[in-house]
């Protein structure tokens, strides 16, 4: 009685269960009653990452330097190449097919998380007591100057974009 279903890592063809090809190999010829499935390793620039019956291996991803990409991890016969972005750039999507420059945090905002090759800069508003007066992809919000520790007094209040201005205390006559 011909099978209607096959075991794991097998496939049904012409009423027969054949072994799938292991990761890193492609199908050359289905099995017969007499012969095992014929598989062939993927070439150097190709891969297959699952047990399969593919007759063609997939091309490794190309990390195009013109798009700001560089190789993070070289592909093998079983894995695809992983691309990342050059310094100062990050991926536009999870699949990292192109890169864009990291955004800077505007004055009044500081860097919460510095950008990586795969994620953009995360900015946060400077809370009370902190400020940022520059547009930067690296600088965090800085605390207002403590006039008191310098034996000075606040002459001008700080904002999220400006530091306090300290001045000498008025001397009592």
């Amino acid at each position: 009685e011909p099978p209607t279903a096959c075991r794991e890592k097998q496939y049904l063809i012409n009423s027969q269960c054949c072994s799938l090809c292991q990761p890193g190999q492609k199908l050359v010829s289905d099995c017969t009653e007499f012969t095992e499935t014929e598989c062939l390793p993927c070439s150097e620039s190709e891969f297959l990452d699952t047990w399969n019956r593919e007759t063609r291996c997939h091309q490794h991803k190309y990390c195009d330097p013109n798009l700001g990409l560089q190789v993070q991890q070289k592909g093998t016969s079983e894995t695809d190449t992983i691309c990342t972005c050059e310094e100062g750039l990050h991926c536009t999507s999870e699949s990292c097919e192109s890169c864009v420059p990291h955004r800077s945090c505007l004055p009044g905002f500081g860097v919460k998380q510095i950008a990586t090759g795969v994620s953009d800069t995360i900015c946060e508003p400077c809370p009370v007591g902190f400020f940022s007066n520059v547009s930067s992809a690296f600088e965090k919000c800085r605390p207002w100057t403590s006039c008191e520790t310098k034996d000075l007094v606040v002459q001008q209040a700080g904002t999220n974009k400006t530091d306090v201005v300290c001045g000498p205390q008025d001397r009592q006559r």
Partner: antibody, heavy 117, light 109 residues
Framework: QVQLVESGGGVVQPGRSLRLSCAAS????????MHWVRQAPGKGLEWVAV????????YYADSVKGRFTISRDNSKNTLYLQMNSLRAEDTAVYYC??????????WGQGTMVTVSS | EIVLTQSPGTLSLSPGERATLSCRAS???????LAWYQQKPGQAPRLLIY???SRATGIPDRFSGSGSGTDFTLTISRLEPEDFAVYYC??????????FGGGTKVEIK
């Protein structure tokens, strides 16, 4: 490279025996089924027998059933055809061929068997 | 047993001409398991076409196969001097036996 080489042919009297061998190289012999196919002088191809890669399945043409036995030794990468009770009509070139789902993709050069008194 | 009948028995043609060889089965054959072989004098057969229409590795594209069911055809679009040989069809769907056709000889006219 992938190669099959037959040997063991010769002239033999009717009723006698002969054993043909087929030496395989250049591929994983133990993964492939193997066939014997013969060709009488001036005639077409006639399939003789097949054996599976693990030797558990064997089939024969009606014309040789009960007289011929196909076998293999995977440790020696060799296929055999034991031919008993030979008849004049068994005179032919005997080829071994590799089994695939694409047909017989590799053939040996053949060995001549002549059954004559 | 599936009987394969090839026609014509002999085909006399000149180089550059088109050759059309026929193989007819006594009952329906799965096209996945119909092959064509070429054999030259003193040589072993060589696999040309498998699965009725797929060319084997290294076979020039002037060779093509077609057909299904009981009627199959091997076509050589433009005969080259090295194509003059005997051609056999074979079915390996229904066995035993694995059956061959009687062959078609393509000779120089």
């Amino acid at each position: 490279q992938v190669q099959l080489v037959e040997s063991g042919g010769g002239v033999v009297q009717p009723g006698r025996s002969l054993r043909l061998s087929c030496a395989a190289s250049g591929f994983t012999f133990s993964s492939y089924g193997m066939h014997w196919v013969r060709q009488a002088p001036g005639k077409g191809l006639e399939w003789v027998a097949v054996i599976s890669y693990h030797a558990s399945s064997k089939y024969y043409a009606d014309s040789v059933k009960g007289r011929f036995t196909i076998s293999r030794d995977n440790s020696k990468n060799t296929l055999y055809l034991q031919m008993n009770s030979l008849r004049a009509e068994d005179t032919a070139v005997y080829y071994c061929a590799r089994d695939t789902s694409r047909g017989h993709d590799i053939w040996g050069q053949g060995t001549m068997v002549t059954v004559s008194s | 047993e599936i009987v394969l009948t090839q026609s014509p028995g002999t085909l006399s043609l000149s180089p550059g001409e088109r050759a059309t060889l026929s193989c007819r089965a006594s009952q329906s054959v799965s096209s996945s398991y119909l092959a064509w072989y070429q054999q030259k004098p003193g040589q072993a057969p060589r696999l040309l076409i498998y699965g009725a229409s797929s060319r084997a590795t290294g076979i020039p594209d002037r060779f093509s196969g077609s057909g299904s069911g009981t009627d199959f055809t091997l076509t050589i679009s433009r005969l080259e001097p090295e194509d003059f040989a005997v051609y056999y069809c074979q079915q390996y769907a229904d066995y035993p036996p694995f059956t061959f056709g009687g062959g078609t000889k393509v000779e120089i006219k």
